[in-house]
Interface confidence: low
């Protein structure tokens, strides 16, 4: 028997520095977690203690904090090289700055293979990207070899900016021939490493003949055997065992997100490459694990540029940006409109001639807007200003909801109106009229939404049975502020870009902004 230790991360999203327990900015260092310096300590400790170790990343290193905003992926290549990752799969967010923003900072600089079998390049891009990412890689580990095949969510064109010269194929269809080739090469230990979410990970384990282990990402799935060490609730045991169609037991793993945990899986193979046993658990990277001093020093050196950046002007406002709770928790506020407009702008993807865009709607809890911005400071808007407005380090995500769920969400928005509560929704691509004289749960009297399958966008009444795409904060997608119906009834959820980054990019693009209060949210009384 031969034993392999797989260490794995996924959806790190730019958390190079240690974070608080909820993966936001570290405030009290003694209670902070994760970060590459602490990760390196644990990885090195395991490498010294065990003979056959692979360190793998299942994608979405890009996007999530000011580190990515400033360094644009160079930080990912630098620190992943320093940690000596063995392989990485491409995630959807690796395309956030277009293909160029992937090629130059990461693909050309990484000293480890970057993988995806289901992304095929065409046209002029094909030669430019040639050999920079691979469908699979065979890695020598001790005196054996292990094949790693990569995969990426085929929804990437809707979630990021891969352009028109990359084709995202069905994961299973693309993986099978690559695994077949590895088998022909006498590679009998094969790991599928990829970024399509837990449901697809399980399907790959079930359907792709020859895959021994699946290491996934995208859905931020937390798996754990026994009592979990922090706040995350396990979606199942670690590893999650899938019985393949050909009768094998295939372990599937994921390690939550944000570098909070290091996935740790031990696999025992027989001489024919069959998995005999698999066990492990994610390791919580808490303050009991010291930060490696050399990596920490390097982090501090890279940090200097970030502090300078946060005070630079992004753009100007010529109007007061009303982000006060007195406005945003009671009525339409222009800060809410600005943020929603930025959210939609960030999701412009012309992937189908029938649609002007794939999504037109935005909702945003008023309680998530934490500060106004005064235009009387020469109109200057900085990252620092935006960090006061959006201090929670969230993301603006894409969900699919039925009209009936949206209607419930808007009823919840005003179910206890007048108490300055955070659930009052700011909107984009939506016209809502409330009648507060009616009883809670029956106060939405008009709800019109902007069409997407149209050449001239116009507002049409919400249809209860239709499925709509909506951009919203991850806080709402996870049922925050009492929006349990969104969490329970959403049909799809893809995590998006860092909230501040979305707004800062929009302001930089527009240069001068002047958002108005324009009748997106109205109140009426009486008969309708």
């Amino acid at each position: 028997a031969w034993e392999l230790t797989i260490l794995h991360t996924n959806d790190v999203h730019s958390r190079l520095e240690q974070t608080s327990e909820d993966s936001s900015k570290c405030v009290n260092a003694s209670r902070c977690m994760g970060g590459v310096a602490r990760l390196f300590t644990k990885v090195q400790q395991i490498r010294r203690a065990e003979p056959n170790v692979l360190l793998l990343d299942a994608g979405d290193q890009y996007q999530g904090t000011i580190w990515f905003t400033v360094y644009k992926g160079a930080e990912v290549a630098h620190f992943m090289n320093a940690l000596r990752y063995d392989a990485m799969a491409l995630g959807n967010h690796e395309f956030d700055n277009g293909v160029e923003g992937l090629i130059e900072p990461l693909l050309k600089e990484a000293k480890f293979p970057i993988l995806s079998a289901n992304i095929k390049a065409k046209g002029p891009l094909a030669s430019q990207i040639s050999g920079l990412y691979l469908p699979y890689k065979v890695l020598p580990v001790g005196d054996e070899v292990v094949g790693i095949v990569g995969y990426t969510s085929k929804e990437t064109p809707f979630l990021s900016n891969p352009g028109t010269n990359l084709v995202f194929e069905d994961e299973i269809t693309a993986l099978q021939p690559e695994v077949d080739k590895l088998k022909t090469l006498n590679v009998n230990k094969i790991i599928a490493l990829g970024h399509s979410g837990f449901e697809m990970d399980k399907l790959i384990a079930q359907k792709v003949r020859g895959v021994d282990v699946v290491v996934g990402g995208h859905s931020n799935t937390f798996l754990y055997t026994g009592n979990p060490p922090s706040k995350e609730v396990p979606a199942g045991k670690y590893p999650f065992i899938v019985t393949s169609d050909d009768g094998r037991k295939v372990p599937v793993v994921q390690a939550y997100a944000f570098g909070k945990y290091l996935g740790y899986l031990k696999i025992e193979f027989d001489e024919r490459g069959n998995v005999i046993s698999s066990h492990g658990n994610p390791i919580l990277l808490n303050s009991s694990i010291p930060e490696d001093p050399s990596i920490k020093a390097d982090i501090n050196k890279w940090r200097i540029k970030l502090d300078n950046y946060s005070t630079q002007e992004l753009g100007k406002t010529i109007v007061y940006l009303d982000g006060s709770s007195q406005s945003c928790r009671f009525r339409e506020c222009n800060m809410g409109n600005l943020i929603c407009d930025a959210m939609i702008n960030n999701n412009l993807r012309h992937t189908d001639e029938m649609f002007w865009n794939h999504v037109s709607m935005c909702i945003l809890n008023g309680g998530g807007i934490r500060s106004p911005i005064d235009e009387r400071n020469n109109g200057t808007i900085t990252w620092e200003n935006l960090a006061a407005v959006l201090p929670f380090g969230g993301t603006f995500d894409l969900v699919q909801l039925k009209g009936s769920t949206l209607k419930k969400a808007f009823e919840h928005s005003v179910h206890r109106y007048g108490q300055s509560t955070g659930e009052f929704l700011q909107v984009g691509g939506i016209h809502v009229v409330y009648d507060l004289s009616r009883k809670p749960g029956d106060r939405v009297v008009k709800l019109d939404v902007l069409c997407t399958k149209c050449r001239v966008p116009s507002y049409d009444p919400l249809k209860m049975d239709e499925v709509y795409k909506v951009i919203l904060p991850n806080f709402l997608a996870n049922g925050g502020d009492g929006f349990q119906m969104i969490k329970d009834e959403l049909l799809r959820h893809d995590s998006g870009d860092q909230d501040i980054n979305v707004v800062s990019t929009y302001i930089s693009k527009m240069k001068v902004i002047y958002p108005a209060v324009e009748g997106r949210i109205k109140f009426s009384t009486g008969s309708h």
Partner: antibody
Framework: QVQLVQSGAEVKKSGSSVKVSCKAS????????ISWVRQAPGQGLEWMGM????????NYAQKFQGRVTITADESTSIAYMELSSLRSEDTAVYYC??????????????WGQGTMVTVSS | QAVLTQPSSVSGAPGQRVTISCTGT?????????IHWYQQLPGTAPKLLMY???RRPSGVPDRFSGSKSGTSASLTITGLQVEDEADYYC???????????FGGGTKLTVL
């Protein structure tokens, strides 16, 4: 960039064996996939088999199974192809070819200059 | 008999566009295995021209392009030049044969 240099031309009698060598330089030989491809005069290309030195074992095309042996010596960075029970239709140019690094692509990026093997009766 | 089928010859005048087809089956191209193309000038070893359907190794001009549809692939040369006169081969992996297979080759003549 790896280079492949093959041994010289051979004239062999029908029923005998031939062993052609392919020396790699300028890279990590053990992790390359080395294939052998032959081309009879005026004919197309035919894949015979491949070896990845780090794996040790070779793979062979069904047509040549039992008649061809592909080996590799990591210490000298040389791959060998031995074909036995030669017949006149084995007269061909024999090429070694590599993908340049295992699993980068299964295309043959680097080729040797070819070794002419003539089988006479 | 080659597993992948190519026309035995094609021709074109300088500056023209020519396409060489490569037809396979559900056990090679149709199964999703990559197609690679080689150029062989008279008396020399083959040279990789295009891999994974449409990627060019460095040094290959962008006049050469590749595509795939179903169980077939094709190599297109635009702006034909005299030095393009050569034999062209397609190659893929075949799951039935558990090995790499070539087309029979296409002789391109530049008129």
């Amino acid at each position: 960039q790896v280079q492949l240099v093959q041994s010289g031309a051979e004239v062999k009698k029908s029923g005998s064996s031939v062993k052609v060598s392919c020396k790699a330089s300028g890279g990590t030989f053990s992790s390359y996939a080395i294939s052998w491809v032959r081309q009879a005069p005026g004919q197309g290309l035919e894949w015979m088999g491949m070896i990845i030195p780090i794996f040790g074992t070779a793979n062979y095309a069904q047509k040549f199974q039992g008649r061809v042996t592909i080996t590799a010596d990591e210490s000298t960075s040389i791959a060998y192809m031995e074909l036995s029970s030669l017949r006149s239709e084995d007269t061909a140019v024999y090429y070694c070819a590599s993908d340049g690094a295992v699993a980068a692509y299964d295309a043959f990026l680097i080729w040797g200059q070819g070794t002419m093997v003539t089988v006479s009766s | 008999q080659a597993v992948l089928t190519q026309p035995s010859s094609v021709s074109g005048a300088p500056g023209q566009r020519v396409t060489i087809s490569c037809t396979g089956t559900s056990s090679n191209i149709g199964a999703g295995f990559d197609i690679h193309w080689y150029q062989q000038l008279p008396g020399t070893a083959p040279k990789l021209l295009m891999y994974r359907f449409s990627r060019r190794p460095s040094g290959v001009p962008d006049r050469f392009s590749g595509s795939k549809s179903g169980t077939s692939a094709s190599l297109t040369i635009t702006g034909l030049q005299v030095e393009d006169e050569a034999d062209y081969y397609c190659q893929s992996y075949d799951s039935g044969q558990r090995g790499w297979v070539f087309g029979g080759g296409t002789k391109l003549t530049v008129l």
